[in-house]
Interface confidence: low
């Protein structure tokens, strides 16, 4: 190999050992029969050398540094050449370094041709091994602007006072151009400006200077984003730290062309703007740090650019001004993460503050819009509390548990609407009366409607789930002793069409001791399946529930249990079941922890089924499933 560096070229070539390998045989640079491990070639020198081994790329690296002095004379602007040409260099991992020194008043601009650059964070590497490391200068201090790969959005980087650009090329890479040019600009009056150009949808992750170490004290760094007008951009902070400020405040500033409120100033912990149309700038401003305990300012953020969907231009008004104790959350539905680029899905308040989830509270009118490629990626969860604190005022009062139409008109699927129903302890109980009779969801007869009501205790210490109920059954009402939550859960987008079938009224009624009472009016020719609350986990200790089952005059009811034994084993107390004819008051009592369950029995009049639990031993729980079937009476037995 022969390397000849012209005089005044200000180029130094250094060939040195790379990271040590476990190769047994050493390799040397051979010059005039001398074996050396490092070779430095300066401007004006010409050196001929060889290597003592077949694969020098496994041993050595080459650094080519060009110093460009813009202080004493004119600066050589324009496209930067790879000198010496890569074809003249040995095939080693190569690093070309350009060190440009300039006056503080001169701005320097690195312009990158296609492909543009993509910034990478600590620990990341570039797929093709080609990396661009860029640093600037503040007085004598070197500041790392960042490390970049190809195929990104960064098109230009502007700095002042000097720039150091290192282009690392693996030995096998055929690249023979620098891929950038240098231009002079007027002073930028800040550390640097990074321009990021989006041609279409995509995302870019960018970092403050020196990341993950601290951003230089009291400095200013700007990112300029070039975004086609028909696309929308959103900013989200992935990671940030604040330093301890003595004077001034650390902040980010957005400059949005055409905005009347420029610059828009945000704290780093604020929700960052979204749904921005067209170009915008983002600046990070540091502060004067506490000398004793400076801390560090650092920021890693993502800009997501995507199409506005039809929805993003629509403003939806959610009027919760007449609601009390209610909150509505729009959030992403859980999905498996995919590795390919997925456009963001945001909900925006007043069209500007966008985030992946948003909670609206009662008492106000809210204007929201969406910035999302597919609104099925979001769903809504609503919570509303209806509480009674004075039993004299609430008794016999009724409330309709209906999803407000404002919420139904939103283009996002409703997942859960939960009503928390709270009553004064030992003073009042609750009754739920559906607009359409309900069916209890069981394995034997599952609900296949687009929504169900999930009824559960809302007493924190009590683990009691009454069940899941959907329209189209035989349960006429459900009475519960104390606080409960009723959740309308939707299972299909067709809920919008079936919304008229929802409708549940809750009334506050005089207190009763049983945990729950189900009033069942079976329809002829259909089998009604009923099961004890807390299915799969067992009826809680010492809990009692009842079913009031109506039998029309011309029908007979067949009561069937689906197990031979209840399976419960009591630690203390007794578990029992009472079946009582309502007309004659005649009753049968069964010990659930001892007796076998009754064989199918026929009832000509309305009857009660009451089940009371003991304190069972762990693992031996009380779960019962039974059915009621009506058939016409063949003989009048009255």
């Amino acid at each position: 190999f022969e390397i000849a560096l012209p005089r005044e070229s200000n180029i130094t070539v250094l060939i040195k050992l790379g990271t040590p390998t476990l190769l047994a045989k050493p390799c040397y640079i051979v010059i005039s029969k001398r074996h050396i491990t490092m070779l430095s070639i300066k401007s004006g020198e010409r050196i001929v050398f060889t290597f003592s081994c077949q694969s020098p790329e496994n041993h050595f690296v080459i650094e080519i540094q060009k110093n460009i002095d813009c202080m004493s004379g004119p600066c050589p602007f324009g496209e930067v050449q790879l000198q010496p040409s890569t074809s003249l260099l040995p095939t080693l991992n190569r690093t070309f370094i350009w060190d440009v020194k300039a006056h503080k008043s001169i701005g320097l601009e690195l312009q990158f041709s296609i492909p543009r650059l993509r910034q990478i964070g600590p620990g990341e590497s570039c797929p093709d091994g080609v990396t661009h490391s860029i640093s600037g200068r503040i007085d004598a201090t070197v500041v790392r602007i960042g490390t970049f790969c190809s195929n990104g959005t960064v098109s230009r980087i502007k700095m002042q006072e000097g720039v150091k650009m290192a282009l690392h090329l693996p030995w096998f890479h055929p690249r023979n151009v620098s891929g950038f040019s240098i231009a002079n600009r007027s002073s930028i009056k800040r550390l640097c400006i990074i321009e990021s150009v989006f041609e279409g949808e995509g995302s870019a992750t960018l970092m403050s200077a020196n990341y993950p170490e601290g951003f230089p004290e009291d400095e200013l760094m700007t990112w300029q984003f070039v975004v086609p007008a028909h696309l929308r951009a959103s900013v989200s902070f992935l990671n940030f730290n604040l330093s301890n400020c003595e004077r001034k405040e650390e902040r980010v500033e957005y400059y949005i062309p055409g905005s009347t409120t420029n610059p828009e100033v945000f704290k780093l912990e604020d929700k960052q703007p979204g749904n921005m149309a067209g170009n915008f700038n983002l600046s990070l401003q540091g502060c004067d740090q506490d000398a004793q305990s400076p801390g560090i300012l650092r920021l890693q953020f993502q800009v997501l650019v995507q199409h506005p969907q039809n929805e993003s231009n629509k403003i939806y008004v959610v009027d919760l001004s007449n609601e009390r104790a209610m909150s509505l959350t729009i959030e992403p539905r859980p999905v498996k993460q995919s590795r390919k680029f997925v456009p963001g899905c945001f909900v925006c308040l007043e069209s500007r503050t966008c985030s992946s989830n948003l909670t609206l509270t009662s008492g106000s009118k809210h204007k929201i819009s969406f910035l999302c490629d597919d609104l099925t990626r979001l769903w809504m969860n609503v919570e509303k509390t209806i509480s009674c604190t004075d039993h004299r005022y609430c008794q016999r009062k009724s409330y309709s548990l209906q999803v407000p139409s404002d919420i139904l008109h939103l283009p996002v699927e409703l997942h859960d609407f939960s009503w928390k129903l709270l009553v004064p302890k030992d003073r009042l109980s609750l009754v739920l009366v559906p607009a359409q009779k309900l069916q209890q969801h069981t394995h034997e007869k599952p609900c296949n409607t687009s929504f169900s009501y999930l009824v559960a205790s809302a007493i924190p210490s009590q683990d009691l789930y009454f069940g899941s109920f959907c329209p189209g059954g035989s349960i006429k009402q459900i009475q519960v002793k104390q606080n409960i939550s009723v959740t309308l859960r939707t299972f299909a987008p067709s809920f919008q069409q079936e919304a008229s079938r929802q409708g549940l009224t809750v009334s506050f009624i005089p207190y009763f001791k049983e945990e729950g009472v189900f009033t069942v009016t079976p329809d002829t020719k259909s089998k009604v399946y009923l099961r004890t609350p807390n299915w799969d986990r067992g009826l809680p200790s010492l809990t009692s529930v009842s079913w009031n089952i109506s039998v029309p005059r011309d029908q007979v009811a067949c009561l069937t249990f689906f197990k031979e034994r209840s399976g419960v084993v009591c630690q203390t107390g007794r578990a029992f079941m009472i079946i009582q004819e309502q007309r004659t008051r005649a009753e049968e009592i069964f010990s659930l922890d001892e007796d076998v369950l009754p064989k199918p029995s026929f009832h000509h009049h309305s009857f009660w089924v009451n089940i009371s639990n003991c304190s069972p031993t762990s693992g031996k729980q009380l779960d019962l499933l039974f059915s009621v079937t009506l058939t016409p009476r063949t003989v009048d037995l009255t």
Epitope: S113, I114, E199, G200, E201, P228, A229, P257, G258, G278
Partner: antibody
Framework: EVQLKESGGGLVKPGGSLKLSCTAS????????MSWVRQTPEKRLEWVAT????????YYSDSVKGRFTISRDTGKNNLYLQMSSLSSDDTALYYC?????????????WGQGTTVTVSS | DIVMTQAAFSNPVTLGTSASISCRST???????????LYWFLQKPGQSPQLLIY???NLASGVPDRFSSSGSGTDFTLRISRVEAEDVGVYYC?????????FGGGTKLEIK
């Protein structure tokens, strides 16, 4: 000097297919966005499709979505429009044109056009 | 879709005098970023369209400064200060604010 030259037009039966090409020279082809625009026999201009610069994102008008595909071969400096399920409404003079997203220009340069006639 | 409307013919003008061509859009082309996404093209007889004005008021490269454009968000005017014989042709306005990009029907400049 920037030059665009379309080719591949011709007479085709309804339901048939055709592939138009546009050969570019005089500029860095990969950097520029490229569009196909057609001019109907009544001299109305209709935007058909765009392929963005650098990232190769595609945009189509509703009238051709699902039937036409815009693509490029940067090595050959060629832009293509693959057309299928053609109907008489697609009869037009087809132009390719450049756009520069960085400056904000659109339709900076146009080719001479190639004629597509759909008729039985 | 945004519809661009133009008169089919201009008022006949004398060479050396000024001419105006109008264009109207069904939606404001003024974006919140301050840019108006309106374009003017000229198609001379037997030629391809050529770009005259981009983003409402910017002169495309090589276009003489006799051409200028102004407007609000929905009403736009292209002015030619001293009409020359080579200005004859059909003038099209277009928008690329929103997909699909749309053109006006074109206005033919007539010389007296």
């Amino acid at each position: 000097e920037v030059q665009l030259k379309e080719s591949g037009g011709g007479l085709v039966k309804p339901g048939g297919s055709l592939k138009l090409s546009c050969t570019a020279s005089g500029f860095t082809f990969s950097v520029y966005g490229m569009s196909w625009v057609r001019q109907t026999p009544e001299k109305r201009l209709e935007w058909v499709a765009t392929l963005s610069g650098g990232s190769n994102y595609t945009y189509y008008s509703d009238s051709v979505k699902g039937r036409f595909t815009i693509s490029r071969d940067t090595g050959k400096n060629n832009l293509y429009l693959q057309m299928s399920s053609l109907s008489s409404d697609d009869t037009a003079l087809y132009y390719c044109a450049t756009e520069d997203g960085l400056i904000g220009t659109w339709g900076d340069y146009w080719g001479q056009g190639t004629t597509v006639t759909v008729s039985s | 879709d945004i519809v661009m409307t133009q008169a089919a013919f201009s008022n006949p003008v004398t060479l050396g005098t000024s001419a105006s061509i109008s264009c109207r859009s069904t939606k404001s082309l003024l974006h919140s970023n301050g840019i108006t996404y309106l374009y003017w093209f000229l198609q001379k007889p037997g030629q391809s369209p050529q770009l005259l004005i981009y983003q409402m008021s910017n002169l495309a490269s090589g276009v003489p400064d006799r051409f200028s454009s102004s407007g609000s968000g929905t009403d736009f005017t292209l002015r030619i200060s001293r009409v020359e014989a080579e200005d004859v042709g059909v003038y099209y306005c277009a928008q690329n604010l929103e997909l699909p990009f749309t053109f006006g029907g074109g206005t033919k400049l007539e010389i007296k």
